[in-house]
């Protein structure tokens, strides 16, 4: 990330509100709980790759394997969901690629009306066969860890049988779970052997234990609930954009910067320039000029279009994006070739009409 002296002030946000434009999402990798997931870091020339999840350094463990440019998650759980990034550190710079991981299945949460199979969970016994409680559908109990977004509905199920018919009660963190323990209380569907909590909040996090008992015995099963909250993020830029470009003198070129931001982003296009014949200020930092920024007078700020370029336009162009949370920036180089020379392709380029002919 460059430091610099500014020829023109780059403020945190524009004085006028940015116009609305499409905000692009990072790539999303979806896995079901228990599956393994492998993601390749889509960055080139990486001397060292480091990984983060939700901004926190990610190291290898018994389920996370980091081999070269690959991240492997074994036996994925909903807690593995989040915003991941791989950063390629090079001798002169570093680049980051972001992607989302979503580990989910339909049983994680949902309302109490989806129990079409509830009746078969309620097993009636022959009155002569006295029997201690037992689980009738362990498949529905395999997923012990439930990571659920705040405000969702959560359902825990303990389908059981026994004779006489067992009763079911619920504990939270080992203590009796009372209605007054949470705003809005909770529902128990005895017919479905389920506990339902609507609109979960972080204070609902914890261990929930169903205790199923009759006079012949008692069994229990514990679920762990984690309520996942989103916090606003600094902007994220799509890897590889803007892309290096080349064109001939007099040609046109476009640089594109794809932004993902859940707070209104402010985009600036900045170029290294000379001031009084020098590229660097007294502090040793390069001089930069803001060419374009998002605002009322700026159309599509994600695109910087240069027309009728001259050799003086060659150089590094920086897409700098900020919101009130933080910043991100990535850069690309423009090569301007003499008129008689045909430009060579570098990455994905948007070339001038001259070149296309």
């Amino acid at each position: 990330r460059p430091s610099f002296s500014l020829v023109e002030d780059t403020t945190l946000e524009p004085e006028e509100p940015p116009t609305k434009y499409q905000i692009s999402q990072p790539e999303v990798y979806v896995a079901a709980p228990g599956e393994s997931l492998e993601v390749r870091c889509l960055l080139k020339d990486a001397a060292v790759i480091s990984w983060t999840k939700d901004g926190v350094h990610l190291g290898p463990n018994n389920r996370t394997v980091l081999i070269g440019e690959y991240l492997q998650i074994k036996g994925a759980t909903p807690r593995d969901s989040g915003l991941y990034a791989c950063t390629a550190s090079r001798t002169v710079d570093s680049e980051t690629w972001y992607f989302m991981v979503n580990v989910t299945d339909a049983i994680s949460s949902g309302d109490d009306e989806d129990d079409t199979d509830g009746a078969e969970d309620f097993v009636s016994e022959n009155s002569n066969n006295k029997r201690a409680p037992y689980w009738t559908n362990t498949e529905k109990m395999e997923k012990r860890l439930h990571a659920v977004p705040a405000a969702n509905t959560v359902k825990f199920r303990c389908p059981a049988g026994g004779n006489p018919m067992p009763t079911m009660r619920w504990l939270k963190n080992g203590k009796e779970f009372k209605q007054e323990h949470r705003i809005g209380g909770y529902k128990v569907r005895n017919q479905h052997w389920s506990l339902i909590m609507e609109s979960v909040v972080p204070s609902d996090k914890g261990n929930y234990t169903c205790v199923v008992e009759n006079e012949y015995g008692s069994i229990n099963h514990t679920y762990h609930l984690d309520v996942v909250e989103r916090s606003p993020h600094r902007p994220i830029l799509q890897a590889g954009l803007p892309a290096n470009a080349s064109t001939v003198v007099g040609g046109d070129v476009e640089f594109v910067c794809k932004v993902y931001s859940d707070a209104q982003p402010h985009i600036q296009w900045i170029k290294h320039v000379e001031k009084n014949g020098s590229k660097y200020g007294p502090d040793g930092l390069p001089y930069l000029k803001v060419l374009k920024h998002s605002g009322i007078n700026s159309s599509n700020a994600e695109v910087l279009a240069l027309f009728n370029v001259t050799e003086a336009d060659a150089g590094e162009y920086i897409c700098k994006v900020s919101n009130y949370i933080g910043q991100a920036n990535q850069s690309a180089w423009l090569t301007v070739l003499p008129k008689q020379q045909a430009p060579g392709r570098e990455k994905e380029i948007t070339a001038s009409p001259d070149y296309l002919e």
């Epitope: 460059p2 610099f4 524009p14 940015p18 209104q264 910043q327």
Partner: antibody, heavy 113, light 107 residues
Framework: QVQLVQSGAEVKKPGASVKVSCKAS????????IHWVKQAPGQGLEWMGA????????SYNQRFKVRATLTADTSTSTVYMELSSLRSEDTAVYYC??????WGQGTTVTVSS | DIQMTQSPSSLSASVGDRVTITCGAS??????LNWYQRKPGKSPKLLIY???NLADGVPSRFSGSGSGTDYTLTISSLQPEDVATYYC?????????FGGGTKLEIK
């Protein structure tokens, strides 16, 4: 967990300067703006400015631009807000906040002759 | 600068009541609005970001709505611990202006 710990209360004379510190921990310091917010007695909240520790970028409310200076020391994960040429109306509680999500406990600055 | 106008400036309600506080911006802020709760002697606490998103650890009785220039903070069932001053804030463009505040008391 994320924590912002501010320096203690200050009593200053008019015309003097004050430098309030805000030490951050529990997150990647360079990746978030630190904002400064003023609350004068009986008044509402007023945004003063922000600094991005990664590159030192600053943005100021014009009302404070002349007298307030924000700096960041990445080696100690600390941000400083210096207010010069103090006057009585600068008497207030000053808060630092990480992207307005996490807030320091506030520093009371009293300007009195 | 974007001006933020909050109303009412103060209100008194009973425990269990539904309470609404409104905030108007002098121009379109595209949903870039935060709500804060400030209790006496305490730091402000983020309740809602991006006009509608509940912040970490905030009870679900708090909700935010609105778009363009008009925004609302709703407390679905007022609790004694909700006594505080509530502020809205423009986070679209600098300066990040706050509303004048709404002081909420229990009857």
């Amino acid at each position: 967990q994320v924590q912002l710990v501010q320096s203690g209360a200050e009593v200053k004379k008019p015309g003097a300067s004050v430098k309030v510190s805000c030490k951050a921990s529990g997150y990647i310091f360079r990746n978030y703006y630190i904002h400064w917010v003023k609350q004068a007695p009986g008044q509402g909240l007023e945004w003063m400015g922000a600094i991005y520790p990664d590159n030192g970028d600053t943005s100021y409310n014009q009302r404070f631009k002349v007298r307030a200076t924000l700096t960041a020391d990445t080696s100690t994960s600390t941000v400083y807000m210096e207010l010069s040429s103090l006057r009585s109306e600068d008497t207030a509680v000053y808060y630092c906040a990480r992207a307005f999500t996490y807030w320091g406990q506030g520093t009371t600055v009293t300007v009195s002759s | 600068d974007i001006q933020m106008t909050q109303s009412p400036s103060s209100l008194s309600a009973s425990v269990g009541d539904r309470v609404t506080i409104t905030c108007g911006a002098s121009e379109n802020i595209y949903g870039a609005l935060n709500w804060y709760q400030r209790k006496p002697g305490k730091s402000p606490k983020l309740l809602i970001y991006g006009a509608t998103n509940l912040a970490d650890g905030v009870p679900s009785r708090f909700s935010g709505s609105g778009s363009g220039t008009d925004y609302t903070l709703t407390i679905s069932s007022l609790q004694p611990e909700d006594v505080a001053t509530y502020y809205c804030q423009n986070v679209l463009s600098t300066p990040y202006t706050f509303g004048g505040g709404t002081k909420l008391e229990i009857k």
